[in-house]
């Protein structure tokens, strides 16, 4: 015998108390599949959450975060405060990255600069709070005659024409 509830479409619930008729989900609730005996209460995007997608009778609302915050967790279950680049969020708020670390995003933690010497390379561009160091060729590669990097042209003295 087929379960009579299997005929109830998404957006309805199968009402055991009314001879298993299909009743529509009330406002602010939904059922995303057929044959359900209950409707799920819609998520409400309140406070720091804002509605990205309204709830319908067949699908839940989706939330994101108000400006200055970003989503964390599955389905944006939490909103976390943004910080500036070069900072990380601590229990006491946004704090600048310590020397030797950087963060190039508005979220996440400060990470240590790359240690170029571990790869046998030299530092081409120093790191900042916002940016990692840029590693260049190894010091051996910079020996005369072996360099693959064109050395910068010497600066010209003002008022002199090239010789």
């Amino acid at each position: 015998l087929q379960d009579p509830c299997s005929n109830c479409p998404a957006g309805t619930f199968c009402d055991n108390n009314r001879n298993q008729i299909c009743s529509p989900c009330p406002p602010n609730s939904f059922s995303s599949a057929g044959g359900q005996r209950t409707c799920d209460i819609c998520r409400q995007c309140k406070g720091v959450f804002r509605t990205r997608k309204e709830c319908s009778s067949t699908s839940n609302a989706e939330c994101d975060c108000t400006p200055g915050f970003h989503c964390l967790g599955a389905g944006c279950s939490m909103c976390e405060q943004d910080c500036k680049q070069g900072q990380e969020l601590t229990k006491k708020g946004c704090k600048d990255c310590c020397f030797g670390t950087f963060n190039d995003q508005k979220r996440g933690i400060c990470r240590p600069w790359t240690n170029c010497s571990l790869d046998g390379k030299s530092v081409l561009v120093n790191g900042t709070k916002e940016r990692d160091v840029v590693c260049g060729p190894s010091p051996a590669d910079l020996s005369p005659g072996a360099s693959s990097v064109t050395p910068p042209a010497p600066a010209r003295e003002p008022g002199h024409s090239p010789q």
């Epitope: 619930f13 009330p26 406002p27 209950t38 799920d40 209460i41 998520r43 409400q44």
Partner: nanobody, 120 residues
């Protein structure tokens, strides 16, 4: 931590009315369906009804003597019981869930209950 507190129970005579209240502390009812269950001595728990978003769903034992309503300002849900009968004697529990109706659902939270006795 959510706490649900029922009140309004007591001993009444057949044919009388009672209004039970369910108040929530620690959280509002805003995002929950609120249900009522009852359990008579030596019997299984019985579903009374569920309220959500202006709609009420009732158990199959009773169609028109019981009415569930809600006062958003007071964060309270009510169970109005009219023309009470001796077989309505039970402990009445308020519960909340993210499901509607709660007829086949294990609630997320449930109160301690309030005793209703109907006796002449």
């Amino acid at each position: 931590e959510v706490q649900l507190v029922e009140s309004g129970g007591g001993t009444v005579q057949p044919g009388d009315s009672l209004r039970l209240s369910c108040a929530a502390s620690g959280r509002t009812f805003d995002n929950y369906a609120v249900g009522w269950f009852r359990q008579a001595p030596g019997k299984e728990r019985q579903y009374v009804g569920t309220y959500w978003s202006g709609y009420a769903h009732y158990g199959d034992f009773e169609n028109n003597r019981f009415t569930i309503s809600r006062d958003n300002a007071k964060n309270t849900v009510y169970l109005q019981m009219d023309n009470l009968k001796p077989e309505d004697t039970a402990v009445y529990y308020c519960a909340i869930s993210l499901k509607y109706p709660m007829a086949t659902v294990t609630p997320d939270y449930q109160g301690q209950g309030t005793q209703v006795t109907v006796s002449s």
